[in-house]
Each structure stands twice: as structure tokens, then as C-alpha cells.
């Protein structure tokens, strides 16, 4: 099982939309896939996919989840608020036929406030 996540870095303005994509691939077929999005280590949602459908479409505050066959799991945040800023990780596990799990690399989301004066030292506070 392979999970690739993108983008690595996403900078959006407050009130706009942010899209995080997780590509889940496995050489053999799977019957049920458990997926999970976390933000700063806290679980936003943990639905599963079976028969081509997600068991849940909501993922955290203002988060919508979608699955596009063959391999794309998308988390869409709309509208984005300042507290959406953080480190997002996508995780996946094939539950059936046999357990195999993997996770993506971090997507760092930066949300710029509508009021630019609130933006002081933002980049400096997130090194790397």
C-alpha cells in the first residue's frame, strides 16, 4: 500500500478554499479501505471506502471528503478559517483482504488573514 499526499505546502487566504489530495495505491484489489485525516496529530475523520463509496462525507470543521477512483482521496476545506492552519496527514489502511497501512507526508497549510496587519511574523513562526 502506498500513500502520496500533496501539496507539501499550501498557502491560502481566509474565506477561500483549500484542497488537499491523498493518492492511495495498491498493486492488488481491496475490499475495504480505512482512511484518516489528522491535523496537528488530532483525528479529523476516519471513514472507510467500500463498494466505491465513502462511509462519511464530512471531515472536520468545514471539511468535505470525496473519493475519485482509482486512487484519489480529496479533503476540501471551504471556507477556510485561520484555525485551519496546521499540519495535515493522510493515512490509509486496507482492512480487507489483509491488513496493510501507510501514511502520506505532511501538508502544511498556512491561512492568510483577510486583514494583512494580522499577518506579522507568520512565516518566521513556521520554519522549514
Amino acid at each position: 500500500l502506498s500513500v502520496q499526499q500533496g501539496p507539501n505546502l499550501l498557502q491560502v487566504r481566509q474565506g477561500s478554499q483549500a484542497t488537499l489530495v491523498c493518492q492511495v495505491d495498491q498493486a492488488t484489489a481491496w475490499e475495504r479501505l480505512r482512511v484518516k485525516w489528522t491535523k496537528d496529530g488530532a483525528i479529523l475523520c476516519q471513514p472507510y471506502i467500500t463498494n466505491g463509496s465513502l462511509s462519511l462525507g464530512v471531515c472536520g470543521p468545514q471539511g468535505r471528503l470525496s473519493w475519485q477512483a482509482p486512487s484519489h482521496l480529496t479533503l476540501q476545506l471551504d471556507p477556510v478559517s485561520l484555525n485551519h492552519s496546521g499540519a495535515y496527514v493522510c493515512w490509509a489502511a486496507v482492512e480487507i483482504p489483509e491488513l496493510e497501512e501507510a501514511e502520506g507526508n505532511i501538508t502544511r497549510l498556512f491561512v492568510d488573514p483577510d486583514d494583512p496587519t494580522q499577518n506579522r511574523n507568520r512565516i518566521a513562526s513556521f520554519p522549514g
Partner: antibody, heavy 120, light 113 residues
């Protein structure tokens, strides 16, 4: 460019253990999302998948031969090793190693194969 | 195990004519989750290793001549060579990767009539 090369004995006696090595060049076997496989083909017959080892170290075997097979990898040498116990003349075949990726599921790169004859 | 049954065992076709090889699987190779068929076709010339031609039942590998095409879904699959060339003389195998153990068809030997 990825190349795979099988090596091992060309002749083994019945009941002996066969050890085959697949040396991978141009690509690291530690790269995530790849499976390293052994496949064999008796003369004039069909291909038969034997075993695989995944990046994580997880293994899978053909149930019909599982009790006789062990697949391992030596990352320091970039090699995948197959051992097959209790060899029999019906195990005479060309043995191939091949890779397979999660993004795909097909055998993309194959070694040239090594013919192993089992005879006393 | 998924059993792959190929037909015919051998096939003789005139140069420039169409060659059709069939592959039947003992269970569906289509996944409703990924909307893919887990079926590949390989060509093996005498003394050589197999080479991938078609993956996911109908996608031609880059560099494979467009006279080769794959079709089918579920349990019934076909490899078609629209206009046989001399270099197409080989054995052809289907292979499923829906589940392990990964299994191959018995092969079809293609010759020139």
C-alpha cells in the same frame, strides 16, 4: 535504468535446497511502494508466481509451495533471495525475478532468468 | 486461487491478418472501489523474459505498437493484434493481480500461417 539479474546453481540434486539471488541495479529495493517477486516457468509451460517481498518486509507466498519457500532481502547488497527446500525434478524451470509497484500491479522489469535443473 | 483460462492454445494467422486471444478468469477482476480491471497481458519471445503489453485490461504500455489492443471487463478479456507482423510471433500470457496468489493463463502460442 533498472536491471535485475538472477544467480544461483544451474543444477541441484533432488531433496537439496535451492538458493537464488536477484541483484537489482539502478534502483534501491528500499524504495517505498515496490514488491520484489520470484516467478518460474518449467520448459514449454506456463508462468507460475512463487513469492513476493514488499518494501516493508511483508511477504506473500504461493499457497501450493508456501511450506518450501522463503523470500528475504539484503538491503546492503540490494538483493532479494529465494530459498526453496526439498527440490524435485518437477521443479526444473527457468526462475525469474521481477518487480511490481503499488502504482500499477504489473511485472514491469524482469531478470533474464536462470535455468535450474533438478536431477540426480 | 483465481484460475486464468486462455484460448486458443495455439493460433496460426497470416501476415497482415487479425489475431485474437481470449482470457477467462474464474472470478471477476473488476474492482468497484478503483473502477479497474486487474488484468495484464504479456508477450514472451523464444529465449526471452516476458514483456508487458497491456495493463488494466485495456491500457497499452508506452512504446507498444498500436496494433496491440486489450478489451473486456469482469471475467472475459481479449488481446487483439489488428495486423500481424513477423515480429509478433511469440507466446502471450494473461495475468491477474486482483489478489494473491498472482496467477497466469496457460499461454497462447502465436505463429504465422
Amino acid at each position: 535504468q533498472i536491471t535485475l539479474k538472477e544467480s544461483g546453481p544451474t543444477l541441484v540434486k533432488p531433496t537439496q535446497t535451492l538458493t537464488l539471488t536477484c541483484t537489482v541495479s539502478g534502483f534501491s529495493i528500499t524504495t517505498g511502494g515496490y514488491y520484489w517477486n520470484w516467478i518460474r516457468q518449467p520448459p514449454g509451460k506456463k508462468l507460475e508466481w512463487l513469492a513476493l517481498i514488499y518494501t516493508s518486509g511483508r511477504t506473500s507466498y504461493n499457497p501450493s509451495l508456501k511450506s518450501r519457500l522463503t523470500i528475504t532481502k539484503d538491503t546492503s547488497k540490494n538483493q532479494v533471495v529465494l530459498t526453496m527446500t526439498n527440490m524435485d525434478p518437477v521443479d526444473t524451470a527457468t526462475y525469474y525475478c521481477a518487480d511490481m509497484a503499488d502504482k500499477g500491479g504489473w511485472f514491469a522489469y524482469w531478470g533474464q532468468g536462470t535455468l535450474v535443473t533438478v536431477s540426480s | 486461487d483465481i484460475v486464468m483460462t486462455q484460448s486458443p492454445d495455439s493460433l496460426a494467422v497470416s501476415l497482415g491478418e487479425r489475431a485474437t486471444i481470449n482470457c477467462l478468469s474464474s472470478q471477476s477482476l473488476f474492482s468497484s472501489n478503483t473502477k479497474r480491471n486487474y488484468l495484464n497481458w504479456y508477450q514472451q519471445k523464444p529465449g526471452q523474459s516476458p514483456k508487458l503489453l497491456i495493463y488494466h485490461a485495456s491500457t497499452r504500455l508506452s512504446g507498444v505498437p498500436d496494433r496491440f489492443s486489450g478489451s473486456g471487463s469482469g471475467t472475459d478479456f481479449t488481446l487483439t493484434i489488428s495486423s500481424l507482423q513477423a515480429e509478433d510471433v511469440a507466446d502471450y500470457f494473461c495475468q491477474q493481480h486482483y489478489e494473491t496468489p498472482l496467477t497466469f493463463g496457460d499461454g497462447t502460442r502465436l505463429e504465422i500461417k
